[in-house]
């Protein structure tokens, strides 16, 4: 039985060359958190070990920068960048939570003049 | 061999303060959640508060009764937790045991102890 | 917060008997949230049965636990000498995290 339920920043967009916090929160249950994984599509970005701390993966060492907390910050955005993201949650004893983030890139002058998504 | 050692308990006054210390060695100590837990004369055990790890930003909980009164927090780089009791009761008389809990790996470990007696 | 009730509240036997002894939650708790500390006098409880039914490293096998939703039971297939002392139940499934009041298992 798990009980626990992830909070995530939901939709959310940002400029292209701009940078961006994705973050999640497990709430609602007392299980112990070993592990958090970032992932893009089927892409490893970053992992927060309890234990261990961060480790980023080398494709993304320049534009992915740990934290703040469990989250990750994405630098130097590009129009590419625009996607779902996941946190993935491994706990002890539950299991596995898995959060959805759906990062939107604008243009510069779109975002200024009409982004479909704020950024809280 | 893991060992912990509670001190800093003692005979106080109704309203008056204690500080508990709990000192840990044999293990590292900052990969492991810590409890305290009491045991009134003669009576059951009683969760009292925990604090997570720095992964966990140091998340603390406490048993209602201590809410306000009771502050747990640790050391990492002293390899100590501490319990501050202010605003002690009659009803705080207890052995406090202070206790290691590293879910994921079933390890378990309780001090011997330390007696507080709150009597005018 | 979860109520853990033990029963009975002591429990008197003779050694090569089994022993069963109940642990009823006010809400289910997820086996995994399940543990069983023993404890002897003077000294500080010691984690006897996590997880519901494993046993914490060096407890012989004629312990064992089962239980699910509220339901929980630790059983002793044939009690030694060493055996008696209060059994307590616990849960970490929610805070705060709780006791039952505890089991004596007492030599009749």
């Known amino acids: 039985m798990m009980t626990g339920t992830i909070e995530t920043t939901g939709n959310i967009s940002a400029e292209k060359g701009g940078s961006i916090i994705l973050q999640c929160h497990l709430s609602s249950t007392t299980a112990q958190v070993t592990q958090v994984n970032w992932e893009q599509q089927d892409q490893l970005l970053a992992i927060c070990n309890a234990d261990l701390g961060w480790h980023i993966s080398p494709s993304f060492k320049d534009r992915v920068a740990p934290g703040p907390g469990l989250g990750l910050t994405l630098q130097s955005l590009t129009v590419n960048d625009t996607g779902e993201y996941f946190c993935i949650y491994h706990t002890y004893p539950d299991g596995t939570y898995t959060g959805r983030i759906f990062l939107e890139v604008l243009e510069s002058s779109v975002a200024e003049h009409g982004a479909r998504f704020q950024i809280p | 061999e893991v060992q912990l050692v509670e001190s800093g308990g003692g005979l106080v006054q109704p309203g008056g303060s204690l500080r508990l210390s709990c000192a840990a060695s044999?293990?590292?100590?900052?990969?492991?959640?810590m409890n305290w837990v009491r045991q009134a004369p003669g009576k059951g055990l009683e969760w009292v508060a925990e604090?997570?790890?720095?992964?966990?930003?140091?998340?603390?909980h406490y048993v209602e009764s201590v809410k306000g009164r009771f502050t747990i927090s640790r050391d990492d780089s002293k390899n100590s937790v501490y319990l501050q009791m202010n605003s002690l009761k009659t009803e705080d008389t207890a052995v406090y045991y202070c206790?290691?809990?590293?879910?994921?790996?079933?390890?378990?470990?309780w001090g011997r102890g330390t007696l507080v007696t709150v009597s005018s | 917060e979860i109520v853990l009730t033990q029963s009975p509240a002591t429990l008197s036997l003779s050694p090569g008997e089994r022993a069963t002894l109940s642990c009823s939650a006010s809400?289910?708790?997820?086996?995994?949230?399940l543990y069983w500390y023993q404890q002897k006098p003077g000294l500080a409880p010691r984690l006897w049965i996590y997880?519901?039914?494993d046993l914490a490293s060096g407890i012989p096998d004629r312990f064992s636990g089962s239980g699910s939703g509220t339901d929980y039971t630790l059983t002793i297939s044939r009690l030694e000498p060493e055996d008696f002392a209060v059994y307590y139940c616990?849960?970490?499934?929610?805070?705060?995290?709780?006791f039952g009041q505890g089991t004596k298992l007492e030599i009749k």
């Open positions: 206790t290691m809990v590293r879910r994921n790996w079933y390890f378990d470990v």
């Open positions: 044999g293990v590292t100590f900052s990969n492991y959640w």
């Open positions: 604090i997570r790890l720095k992964f966990n930003d140091y998340a603390t």
């Open positions: 809400s289910s708790v997820s086996s995994g949230y």
């Open positions: 997880s519901t039914s």
């Open positions: 616990h849960q970490w499934s929610s805070y705060p995290y709780t």
